[in-house]
């Protein structure tokens, strides 16, 4: 098979016919050295998945449930292209499965037992698989057959297509459980009508159902959504209050050697020539031979799935949890309201060792998961492989965009008795230079720069945000002659100054010697002209406070701060000479784990926090000899956030605006995936 050929998998005679037509029409519009289509016919979508995994085919389009099957080992396929619906300007690639209730009712998600339920149909995503999957562990045992367990959980239901003879309670609200529009409560609109008519207390539908059935806002205001955290929100707030986000229809390919760029090139060309209203002789999104062949007839086009987005991220934690519960039928032995151990995400080797020590001292209440970069850790928290970690504000922003929430803030200045309940204003991001140099904020061009890491607040977002507004382009590697900004492209001049050692050169973790606050300052000491760090970095690493060979003889007076007005000041005057105020680092977690993480951490800091005086013979949570492992070493306590419990509120409008502006320069694959 030529390497420019995409072998499309078809699952019926009609699909195979359309595939051949697709192949022939693409041949007529693409150059001979461009991508081509070959057709492979299989008996089912599962056979197609296996064929792609075995390298007998390259691509197929699947519904969400099958994307889950495709991702499971040994298939290991990944989403590469998504169909979108709606307009090109506002493309919809996902819908949200929601639980709708009347505003005048007074129960929450964890109080559904004994209520009456309205479903779109047996085995359907939004109406059955997702809600029942998420409720699975609350269903009465035995949970098999599932229909019986559901019938015993709710006091009455309408589940179109269920067996009314065996499970009469499932048809209590719609006698016979009719499986077509003859049943007034069938499908999305029907399930909503079941709620509207007062037959049921809750309807499991998709987010658009309410808008499609109630054009009038005043009417919509009579309804609310049940959220997984046992609160309610208005029907407009479905993005923050849903049971799961469900991808509509997706092209999958192999994770390794999957030809994803070729598949995208092919489909992008295909939508240009044969997309909606493009051609009379062949239409990608319709067919005379049948409905939804190869692609959905309702699709309007394709979008490339960002490369960082694997199937776990694409399907989302809630969706995977629901489907896994249904498929595997396993539930934790502990009651679900009891906090399980919290899995902390540790960055590379050094943090993992400290985490292991913490785990032992916590008697197993903390467990450890590792990743090589902060973004990989955030992704692990998103998909449930880990639960929490403490992050610099720049990463709190990325984590927030990825659906995580801040849980506790690191406090650096508040003495102990009041610390836990105090909201600090933040720390200062500063630019440090050697006193002997003649540098100012205005003549940094062509100099050597040292950064904590790309994407971090003091080391990147603030200085580069200020620089961007001055130079109006993102080519920071051309502005500085060279530098060390861990996380930059390895061949960039902003990796040139990094120290490594070799395989870890410029990696955004502690294996890179110039990573983090202390690392960026060391970079200035040994090689650089300017370091972008926090205001405490110089005092914490001079005057013998850092015993490492490179730092032990350093004097604070040999360093100065650059002020934005072009002047310079002593490192003792950050309040009058800083680039911006930075939000304190904060612990983040998934919403469903936030309360457990908070409770456990407050308990852990009482045992291992700054009240421990002898860290040589006791475990100390906030100590790692200037390495800032797991938490900043200058943390006094972890403080409650009170109402600052979203990333926007925590970071503040000004900082969010600054980082959002800098997004046009973003090199964050995770941010790209989370905003897809």
């Amino acid at each position: 098979v030529p390497e420019k050929s995409v072998r499309w998998c078809a699952v019926s005679e009609h699909e195979a016919t359309k595939c051949q037509s697709f192949r022939d029409h693409m041949k007529s519009v693409l150059p001979s050295n461009g991508p081509s289509v070959a057709c492979v016919k299989k008996a089912s979508h599962l056979d197609c998945i296996r064929a792609i995994a075995a390298n007998e085919a390259d691509a197929v389009t699947l519904d969400a449930g099958l994307v889950y099957d495709a991702y499971l080992a040994p298939n290991n396929l990944k989403p590469v292209v998504a169909e979108f619906y709606g307009s090109k300007e506002d493309p919809q690639t996902f819908y949200y499965a929601v639980a709708v209730v009347k505003k005048d009712s007074d129960f929450q998600m964890n109080q559904l037992r004994g209520r009456k339920s309205c479903h779109t149909g047996l085995g359907r995503s939004a109406g059955w698989n997702i809600p029942i999957g998420l409720l699975y562990c609350d269903l009465p045992e035995p949970r098999k057959p599932l229909e019986k367990a559901v019938a015993n959980f709710f006091s009455g239901s309408c589940v179109p297509c269920a067996d009314g003879t065996d499970f009469p309670q499932l048809c209590q609200l719609c006698p016979g459980c009719g499986c077509s529009t003859l049943n007034q409560y069938f499908s999305y609109s029907g399930a909503f009508k079941c709620l509207k008519d007062g037959a049921g207390d809750v309807a499991f539908v998709k987010h658009s159902t309410i808008f499609e059935n109630l054009a009038n806002k005043a009417d919509r205001d009579q309804y609310e959504l049940l959220c997984l955290d046992n609160t309610r929100k208005s029907v407009d707030e479905y993005k923050d209050c849903h049971l799961a986000r469900v991808p509509s229809h997706t092209v999958v390919a192999r994770s390794v050697g999957g030809k994803e760029d070729l598949i995208w090139e092919l489909l992008n060309q295909a939508q240009e020539h044969f997309g909606k209203d493009k051609s009379k002789e062949f239409q990608l999104f319709s067919s005379p031979h049948g409905k939804d062949l190869l692609f959905k007839d309702s699709a309007h086009g394709f979008l490339k799935v960002p490369p960082r987005m694997d199937a776990k991220m694409y399907l989302g934690y809630e969706y995977i949890t629901a489907i896994r519960n249904l498929r595997e039928g396993t539930c934790p032995e502990a009651p679900t309201d009891e906090c399980k151990p919290v899995k902390w995400c540790a960055l590379s080797h050094h943090e993992r060792l400290k985490c292991d020590e913490w785990s032992v001292n916590s008697a197993g209440k903390i467990e450890c998961e590792s990743a090589e970069t902060t973004e990989d850790c955030i992704a692990k928290i998103m998909n449930g492989e880990a639960d929490a970690m403490s992050l610099d504000g720049g990463f709190v922003y990325i984590a927030g965009m990825c659906g995580l929430v801040p849980v506790l803030a690191e406090n650096y200045n508040t003495p102990n008795p009041n610390c836990e309940n105090t909201a600090e204003e933040g720390y200062f991001a500063v630019a440090v230079v050697k006193s002997s140099s003649d540098l100012t904020w205005d003549n940094l061009k062509g100099k050597k720069s040292c950064h904590t890491a790309v994407g971090r607040t003091a080391g990147w977002n603030i200085p580069m945000g200020l620089l961007y507004s001055k130079i109006n382009h993102c080519r920071f590697d051309e502005f500085f002659s060279e530098g060390c900004a861990p996380g930059s492209e390895k061949n960039s001049s902003l990796c040139k100054l990094c120290m490594g050692p070799s395989p870890n050169l410029c990696e955004p973790n502690n294996k890179e010697g110039y990573y983090g606050y202390t690392g960026a300052f060391r970079c200035l000491v040994e090689k650089g002209d300017v370091a972008f760090v926090k205001h405490q970095t110089v005092p914490q690493n001079t005057g013998g406070k850092n015993p490492d060979a490179w730092a032990k003889n350093l004097k604070e007076e040999d360093y100065e701060l650059l002020c934005l007005d072009g002047s310079r000041k002593s490192v003792q005057e950050p309040a009058n000479c800083h680039l911006a105020r930075a939000p304190n680092h904060a612990v983040v977690a998934r919403k469903d784990k936030a309360d457990c993480v908070q409770t456990l951490l407050l308990d852990q800091q009482r045992m291992f926090g700054s009240s421990v005086t002898d860290c040589s013979s006791n475990f100390c949570l906030f100590e790692s000899k200037t390495k800032d492992l797991l938490f900043r070493d200058d943390t006094v306590c972890l403080a409650k956030l009170h109402d600052r419990n979203t990333y926007e509120k925590y970071l503040g409008e000004e900082y969010v605006k600054a980082v959002t502006n800098l997004r046009k320069c973003s090199t964050s694959p995770l941010l790209e995936a989370c905003t897809f």
Epitope: L353, V360, S616, S617, F619, C620, K627
Partner: nanobody, 117 residues
Framework: EVQLVESGGGLVQPGGSLRLSCAAS????????MAWYRQAPGKGLEWVAG???????NYRDSVKGRFTISRDNSKNTMYLQMNSLRAEDTAVYYC???????????WGQGTLVTVSS
């Protein structure tokens, strides 16, 4: 800084037992936490078990009920009693004391445990 030396490894059949020792050149009395790690051929380093100064212990799931960690502060020694050994326990075993707070990259020679019939 305390220097640690591991011993007690060897070849053992599946289901057999071994007792590893970790001897310290200085006093371990004041050391907060000690632990055993292992590295199987071609794999990364993984934590096996840990013990606090007061004697609280914690184990990775796959060794719970089979391995027992203990320490004798008067002899400046930590132990790992390994029972019901399996082929997947084959690895070089290292001990660490965490005491430097640098969470260093420096490990001793370790002691090789081979479980094979």
């Amino acid at each position: 800084e305390v220097q640690l030396v591991e011993s007690g490894g060897g070849l053992v059949q599946p289901g057999g037992s071994l007792r590893l020792s970790c001897a310290a050149s200085g006093s371990i009395f004041s050391i907060a936490t000690m632990a055993w790690y292992r590295q199987a051929p071609g794999k990364g380093l993984e934590w096996v078990a840990g013990i606090t100064r007061s004697g609280s212990t914690n184990y990775r799931d796959s060794v719970k009920g089979r391995f027992t960690i203990s320490r004798d502060n008067s002899k400046n020694t930590m132990y790992l009693q390994m029972n019901s050994l399996r082929a997947e326990d084959t690895a070089v075993y290292y001990c660490t004391d965490y005491s430097s707070r640098y969470y260093h990259d420096y490990w001793g020679q370790g002691t090789l445990v081979t479980v094979s019939s």
